[in-house]
């Protein structure tokens, strides 16, 4: 074994690595020191360290080591924020389109059905959106939502526009009958299908990723120990006590300790690799129904399949609904 | 046959795009992620040699410093000695993972599981028949493409893609616009929706 | 016509509960959202809670949640407050209000005449 | 999940217009979320003005109107009469589909 280099007479060099890291001075010995204090970089002989430099440098080693996390994840953050703002954005875009759509096919095929179909058109997307971004929506109540505020429209407008005023009041049967009589058949329930399954899957194809981000935040953050201080502190720095400026590290001891310092981190690994796997088996099924950019752009065809259905059923429904809802008016007015 | 929107008030001006070679869609973007994310898939395992290999160690030196002592790079010593009575590494090990990271760990087990339940095998058909009532016109069986768009003579495809493109072309709001509508036809019947989301590299 | 109907308000102790009651009319009720909504002597309007038209979503605000429970009776067309837990500053008067919409909270169309709830020993 | 702000007191003599604001944050005013006015009377249940931002329910005299911009709402009463003196209240709800309230404002017709 080669014997080790006698260490700096005077501590000289020590000084100048050392000013670097802390202006000011007192805290190197002039020449070296017997170290009896020192807690990390225990000496063997003589030493151009004190405890107070041994402070410093364990509050570097942990600084060095937080910044080599953060650069070394610095790629993979950039990937995962980036598509997330992308993907939200381009979500929010076929909604906007898909809205458009719809209110395109009412004003070109039923006018006398616009504005009021603007507007449920609107807070169905709205609702749409609010769904894709988290809110605690069920998708069944929106759809129904939908019908329940077209049928009347429907009814009033299409199948007996000659309704005077009055009979207005009727909106709240027409609401009750739109289910009990399944008026629309069974597009609304296609359309719930549809539209759950798509949204389900495009939102937590959002909520992943905002979880990735987290994780990389999470160990990006990551504040290491003392011991782990210690440790880097050891690998990194006790050499210049020796006057060893120029020496690095061994890899293995180098591994060594960081799988000491990550052991926590490293955790991590299991899980990631099946997020990363559940990710990609998500994203391989996310076709027809469970792709929301196709069914959500192919709405407007389907509603307007199911008002054509009520229009073909007019004469049977308005006879039935006739009864059923003059009734009720009468009631109201008792 | 039904008048399908392709009034869609847009500014004809606005709709002169121009060819674009690489056409992509919100489906290739999601494989173009995955597969980018698939060579992160062993980030964590890796860390520990990463930041040793971008942090200064001896690579080509004769000589490396053991934690305790100027050793020769391939000796026991090197990897070993810098351990000796100075703390308990297995003990640091034995610690778990801090609160946060045991965190995280709990928040990823449950997306996995969410995912798991959402990936369902290929060829997944609509839980129930939908047709169970009888449709009279544009019936539609279990999971078909055609159902998402129903029926009729002059039936516009809706083009399943998302384009990504170079410049923006249009940006569609009947809010905005109710009175100026313009007749803009798709080209080959198809209605497909452009943006400009710049490529993530 | 449309119609909200409170009861169940009066003077409870604190840590006692209570139970309100909204009887709906003239509207079909399981199409819409309902809320309860309070209001303090002198002060403002408070949301207190909300409920889908399904009843399958429920909402609270921060100060009642765990301590106060909505639920609705489609079939006999009544809203309900179960109130665990009473504090003092639950003195109030609840108003039960319809929804516009049926899926979520949007904007209270039909309100009800309210009724007292005091918390006192 | 915190209240709107709205200024606590308005005033206006009959003929002129009186706004009132209401702001909010960008999950709830902010968001895809609409935003209701209401008017109240002492002792009496509130009425509701405005909902999905501008849309007045039928009855409603159109000297009340409502925009939203960004994080702020307002309403307009324009050509103010005496029994327009009332508390007014603004709501929208956040991401997560709770209610919030502003604190409401008191409208004095002077004269």
């Known amino acids: 074994q080669p014997p080790p280099p006698p260490p700096d007479a005077t501590c000289h060099q020590v000084r100048s690595f050392f000013q670097r890291l802390q202006p000011g001075l007192k805290w190197v010995p002039e020449t070296p020191v017997p170290g009896s204090d020192l807690q990390v970089c225990l000496p063997k002989g003589p030493t151009c360290c004190s405890r107070k430099m041994e402070e410093k440098y364990q509050l570097t080693a942990r600084l060095n080591m937080e910044q080599l996390l953060q650069s070394a994840s610095m790629e993979l953050k950039f990937l995962i924020i980036q598509n997330a703002a992308v993907f939200q954005e381009a979500f929010e875009i076929v909604v906007r389109h898909a809205k458009n759509y719809t209110n395109a096919m009412f004003k070109n095929n039923y006018p006398s059905l616009t504005p009021q179909a603007f507007e449920f058109v609107g807070e169905f997307f709205t609702d749409v959106s609010l769904y894709i971004l988290g809110s605690d929506i069920n998708v069944d109540d929106m759809v129904n939502e939908l019908f329940d505020s077209l049928f009347p429209v429907i009814y009033t407008q299409l199948m007996n526009p000659g309704l005077p005023d009055s009979a207005l009041d009727i909106n709240e049967c027409l609401r009750g009958a739109r289910r009990d009589l399944k008026v629309f058949g069974n597009f609304p329930k296609l359309i719930m299908t549809q539209v759950s399954k798509s949204l389900q899957v495009t939102r937590i194809f959002l909520q992943a990723l905002n979880l990735g981000i987290e994780v990389i935040n999470t160990t990006d953050h990551l504040k290491f120990s003392k011991d782990c201080g210690r440790m880097l502190t050891r690998m990194w720095y006790c050499s210049y006590c020796q006057g060893l400026m120029m020496v690095k590290p061994c890899g293995g001891y180098c591994n060594v300790v960081m799988q000491g310092c990550m052991a926590g981190v490293v955790e991590i690994d299991k899980y990631w690799r099946e997020y990363i796997l559940s990710l990609e088996e998500l994203v391989n099924g996310m076709y027809r129904i469970y792709d929301m950019e196709n069914v959500l752009l192919g709405l407007f065809s389907t509603i307007h399949d199911s008002i054509q259905y009520v229009q073909k059923n007019a004469g049977k429904l308005t006879t039935t609904i006739g009864k059923l809802c003059a009734h009720s008016q009468q009631r109201q007015y008792r | 046959s039904a008048y399908y929107p392709e009034d869609l008030f847009i500014d004809k001006k606005v709709l002169k795009v121009a060819h674009v070679e690489h056409e992509e869609t919100l489906s290739s973007r999601r494989r173009e992620l995955i597969q980018k994310l698939k060579s992160f898939i062993s980030f964590y395992s890796a860390l520990p040699g990463y930041i040793c290999s971008h942090s200064p160690v001896a690579e080509n030196d004769t000589l490396c410093w053991n934690g305790q002592e100027l050793v020769e790079r391939y000796s026991q010593k090197a990897a070993r000695n810098g351990m000796k009575n100075q703390f308990n590494l297995h003990e640091l090990k034995m610690k778990g993972p801090e609160p946060v990271v045991s965190q995280i760990i709990d928040k990823l087990k449950h997306i996995n599981q969410l995912l798991r339940t959402m990936s369902m095998p290929k060829g997944r058909v609509l839980d129930k028949n939908l047709d169970e009532e009888g449709f009279e016109s544009g019936d539609c069986g279990d999971d078909e493409d055609e159902c998402i768009g129903g029926s009729g003579d002059g039936m516009i495809k809706v083009k399943n893609q998302l384009r990504f493109l170079a410049e923006l072309a249009y940006d569609l709001d009947v809010d905005d616009a109710p009175g100026n509508s313009q007749q803009a036809t798709p080209k080959d019947n198809e209605i497909s929706t452009f943006h400009n989301l710049g490529n993530v590299h | 016509q449309v119609q909200l109907q409170e009861s169940g308000g009066g003077l409870v102790q604190p840590g006692r509960s209570l139970r309100l009651s909204c009887a709906a009319s003239g509207f079909t009720f399981s199409s819409y959202a309902m809320h309860w909504v309070r209001q303090a002597p002198g002060k403002g309007l408070e949301w207190v809670s909300a409920i889908s038209g399904s009843g399958g979503s429920t909402y609270y605000a921060d100060s009642v949640k765990g301590r106060f429970t909505i639920s609705r009776d489609n079939s006999k067309n009544t809203l309900y407050l179960q109130m665990n837990s009473l504090r003092a500053e639950d003195t109030a008067v609840y108003y039960c209000?319809?929804?516009?919409?049926?899926?979520?909270?949007?904007?209270?169309?039909?309100w009800g005449q309210g009724t007292l709830v005091t918390v006192s020993s | 999940q915190s209240a709107l702000t709205q200024p606590p007191s308005a005033s206006g003599s009959p003929g002129q217009s009186v706004t009132i604001s209401c702001t909010g944050t960008?999950?709830?005013?902010?968001?895809?979320?609409?935003v209701s006015w209401y008017q109240q009377y002492p002792g009496k249940a509130p009425k509701l003005l405005i909902y999905?931002?501008?849309n007045r329910p039928s009855g409603v005299p159109d000297r009340f109107s409502g925009s939203k911009s960004g994080t702020s709402a307002s309403l307009a009463i324009t050509g103010l009469q005496a029994e327009d003196g009332a508390d007014y209240y603004c709501?929208?709800?956040?991401?997560?589909?709770?209610?919030?309230f502003g604190g409401g404002t008191k409208v004095t017709v002077l004269g």
């Open positions: 999905g931002n501008s």
């Open positions: 709501q929208s709800y956040d991401s997560s589909l709770r209610v919030v």
């Open positions: 209000a319809k929804d516009r919409r049926g899926s979520h909270a949007d904007a209270f169309d039909v």
């Open positions: 960008s999950s709830d005013v902010g968001g895809y979320n609409y």
